[in-house]
């Protein structure tokens, strides 16, 4: 069975940011700004035609 | 620091796991200058199919 889509789990540290409780709440400005920057960044990295998008962004303390 | 975890989706056959990681790692310097994000400890793995099917089901 093939979906025609490949999924990859990716994790990384952002060492110059501090985790706080607002990153547990998707309605906060801090959460939304970071999510927007990361989404934009991945669109830049994987510019080639095969990239479909990202999902399930989670932030945790490092 | 902040740990970011996410799932990336690509059209099947267009990229292997090595290039997902390599392309991300090669962008780290630009990420620091453009987004002020200092990225380290990158880890990439393929998601087993049952999980991908569920995540695609929304």
């Amino acid at each position: 069975l093939s979906t025609g889509v490949s999924f990859f789990f990716l994790s990384f540290h952002i060492s110059n940011l501090q985790f706080n409780s607002s990153l547990e709440d998707p309605s906060t400005d801090y959460y939304q700004e970071l999510q927007r920057d990361i989404s934009e960044m991945f669109l830049q990295i994987y510019k080639q035609g095969g990239f479909l998008g990202l999902s399930n962004i989670k932030f945790r303390p490092g | 620091s902040v740990v970011v975890q996410l799932t990336l989706a690509f059209r099947e056959g267009t990229i292997n796991v090595h290039d997902v990681e390599t392309q991300f790692n090669q962008y780290k310097t630009e990420a620091a200058s453009r987004y002020n994000l200092t990225i380290s400890d990158v880890s990439v793995s393929d998601v087993p199919f049952p999980f991908s099917a569920q995540s695609g089901a929304g």
Partner: antibody, heavy 120, light 107 residues
């Protein structure tokens, strides 16, 4: 047409170094990754590593990390592989091979191979 | 590292026979599987990529199949010019390991 032409056979003494070249023609050198593969006499193929000539990014098979260095000269459209501290087990034919372009996960063109013989 | 186990290591068959070579990966390589043909004293030549796509100029008697960890290369009707050693290769993750090869001979 695409061609990868490698340098000639070499005979070296144990402990010496050797630099093998791979001259590319018929395509834009900087837009394709170049890989190197080892084939010991009568044996199978062993992937050593690659260089992206556009960015000079290299990735090595851990087994060859301290044995080989991959470089590229954009102006000469030539990739190089240097082998250090040669031992008898380094005796082999070494191939350069071009990886296809975007989303092309295969070696579409190979050099003719360079035989490196290590003998005292 | 992903190990590629190729079988058989050698094979003798008659002209016109159907021949199948198999390759098993130690992990899922998601169809990033390549087959090469190497004739004595020559460089390897690309036959099949993405597990089943035949490269231009390769006769249609060659076909690739499989998924996940199990892959095969089939020659539907063996010809004398098919005498060679065949290698599979993992192109999913580094190191891009090869199988140990299958030496194909004519009976």
């Amino acid at each position: 047409q695409v061609q990868l032409v490698q340098s000639g056979a070499e005979v070296k003494k144990p402990g010496a170094s050797v630099k093998v070249s791979c001259k590319a023609s018929g395509y834009t050198f900087t837009t394709y990754t170049m890989h190197w593969i080892k084939q010991a006499p009568g044996q199978g193929l062993e992937w050593m590593g690659y260089i992206n000539p556009g960015s000079d990014y290299t990735h090595y098979n851990q087994k060859f990390k301290d044995k080989a260095t991959l470089t590229a000269d954009k102006s000469a459209s030539t990739a190089y592989m240097e082998l250090y501290s040669l031992r008898s087990e380094d005796t082999a034919v070494y191939y350069c091979a071009r990886q296809g372009n975007y989303a092309a996960y295969y070696f579409d063109y190979w050099g003719q191979g360079t035989l490196v013989t290590v003998s005292s | 590292d992903i190990q590629m186990t190729q079988s058989p290591s050698s094979l003798s068959a008659s002209v016109g026979d159907r021949v199948t070579i198999t390759c098993r990966a130690s992990g899922n390589i998601h169809n990033f599987l390549v087959w090469y043909q190497q004739k004595p004293g020559k460089s390897p030549k690309l036959l099949v990529y993405n597990a089943k796509t035949l490269t231009d100029g390769v006769p249609s008697r060659f076909s690739g199949s499989g998924s996940g960890t199990q892959y095969s290369l089939t020659i539907s009707s063996l010809q004398p010019e098919d005498v060679a050693t065949y290698y599979c290769q993992n192109f999913w993750n580094v190191p891009f390991t090869f199988g140990s090869g299958t030496k194909l001979e004519i009976k």
